[in-house]
């Protein structure tokens, strides 16, 4: 005999909620499985200039990705199969996987705010590495890709310690077109840009950090209630 | 031993065309910025143009733009000034030159260059 | 008209320290390395030095080059009568790319 009223509400809000969350992994795994493997994008986790390699942060970004998608696809699978099927222990091992979940993001929030200056320095330095290599070698199209996206998702172009060789192929060839960037290029210094991401702007990732641990919540009140639910509904 | 060798220069009428070339030894071409830099006979130098290794980025003095073009063929080690549209002041000894670039990305000179070929425009 | 300014000529006698300038502005040499070359009677320009103090292999130490603001200085100490050529010194300018001075020919006396 299955759950009724609001418990069965509560099952299917739970099953199409990690349904979700279940394809956003799969998404997230394919990406960074993608990025890992394609040629184009593989060269990216590997550009250095001369000896100087690519800063830890980004080699070691892409397996976490990976990693995150595999575990959001395990446990939006739990909680999908365990709301349908009704499963007590698989709900259990769903709202165990949420509480460690959690204790992660805390403690990932808690070493992000920490060491924030090194990651933005890391970002700093792998922006300057990737320009250098653009410019040097232009024929490193990964390392052009990277510039530009630099360049577009911050909005900016370049930083005032740049030399004048690369100011010239900045103006020229890598600034956003069609911005007033071109005409004005240190206004927008992209090691400016990083800076405010990380402290100005840290308030928006501590926002989606916060919106993140409140849905984990809610998962995690929604899964033992069906829980006892389908206990209470297997002793009648 | 590391070589520019320019040819291609002779005279020319007004209005007309010359294409230099300017072969490289004892380098690999391919991996480095190209410059052309001309000199009037008994004057002071004067930057023609430059070319980043694979030609992606291509710069012209303002004397020049619209009229010359440079291009590179990296697979036959050579380097190459399109010069359309002559004019009497382009008369000159043109040098093609390596360019050196150092650490961060700083321009540090042009360290090798050729022997020079003449160009006279001339009615 | 070259936007860095050389004297046209320097004289000194073997042995003396001469020195050569290349002013510019604040765009130009200011906030660039300069480089400068030698340029032997009848022969093609040769690199003598590169960003502002740095001698290629194969150039004498009695070469040498700084610079302080917005002017860079050249000196050659213990000259030579080979020495006798044309000075030129040049920036990468952002706007204007590969900006040569005007040229300084120097004349070895005696």
């Known amino acids: 005999m299955g759950v009724e009223g609001c418990t069965k509400c509560i099952k299917y809000l739970l099953f199409v909620f990690n349904f979700v969350f279940w394809l956003a992994g799969g998404v997230i795994l394919g990406v960074a499985l993608w990025l890992r493997h394609d040629p184009q994008t593989t060269n990216l986790l590997y550009l250095e200039l001369g000896d100087k390699p690519a800063p830890n942060t980004f080699y070691v970004g892409i397996y976490i990705l990976i990693a995150v998608g595999a575990v959001m696809m395990f446990v939006g699978f739990l909680g999908c199969y365990g709301a349908i099927q009704e499963s007590q222990c698989l709900l259990g091992t769903f709202f165990t996987c949420l509480v460690i979940l959690f204790a992660c993001e805390v403690a990932a929030g808690i070493w992000g705010f920490v060491n924030k200056d090194q990651i933005a320095k890391d970002v700093k330095q792998f922006y300057d590495q990737a320009l250098q290599q653009a410019v040097v070698d232009d024929d490193a199209n990964n390392a052009k890709a990277v510039v530009k996206t630099f360049h577009e998702t911050l909005d900016c172009c370049g930083s005032s310690t740049l030399s004048a060789l690369t100011t010239s192929v900045l103006k020229n060839n890598l600034c956003p077109s069609g911005s007033n960037i071109i005409s004005n290029l240190f206004k927008e210094d992209c090691h400016q840009k990083i800076d405010d991401l990380f402290s100005g702007k840290l308030y928006l990732i501590g926002i989606a950090a916060i919106v993140v641990a409140v849905i984990m919540i809610f998962e995690m009140i929604l899964s033992m209630v069906l829980c006892c639910g389908i206990r209470n509904s297997s002793v009648y | 031993e590391v070589q520019l060798l320019e040819s291609g220069g002779g005279l020319v009428q007004p209005g007309g065309s010359l294409r230099l070339s300017c072969a490289a030894s004892g380098f690999t071409l391919g991996s480095y910025w190209m410059s052309w830099v001309r000199q009037v006979p008994g004057k002071g130098l004067e930057w023609v143009s430059s070319i980043s290794s694979s030609s992606s980025y291509i710069y012209y003095a303002d004397s020049v733009k619209g009229r010359f073009t440079i291009s590179r063929d990296n697979s036959k080690n050579t380097l190459y000034l399109q010069m359309n549209s002559l004019r009497a002041e382009d008369t000159a000894v043109y040098y093609c030159?390596?360019?050196?670039?150092?650490?961060?990305?700083?321009?540090?000179?042009?360290?090798?260059w050729g022997q020079g070929t003449l160009v006279t425009v001339s009615s | 008209q070259s936007v860095l300014t050389q004297p046209p000529s320097a004289s000194g006698t073997p042995g003396q320290r001469v020195t050569i300038s290349c002013s510019g502005s604040?765009?130009?040499?200011?906030?660039?390395?300069v480089n400068w070359y030698q340029q032997l009677p009848g022969t093609a320009p040769k690199l003598l030095i590169y960003?502002?103090?740095n001698r290629p292999s194969g150039v004498p130490d009695r070469f040498s080059g700084s610079k302080s603001g917005t002017t860079a200085s050249l000196a050659i100490s213990g000259l030579r009568s080979e020495d006798e050529a044309d000075y030129y010194c040049?920036?990468?300018?952002?706007?204007?790319?590969?900006?040569f001075g005007g040229g300084t020919k120097l004349t070895v006396l005696g």
């Open positions: 960003g502002n103090s």
């Open positions: 604040s765009s130009n040499l200011g906030s660039n390395t």
């Open positions: 030159a390596r360019q050196r670039i150092g650490d961060l990305v700083v321009h540090y000179g042009l360290d090798v």
């Open positions: 040049e920036v990468w300018d952002s706007d204007s790319y590969v900006t």
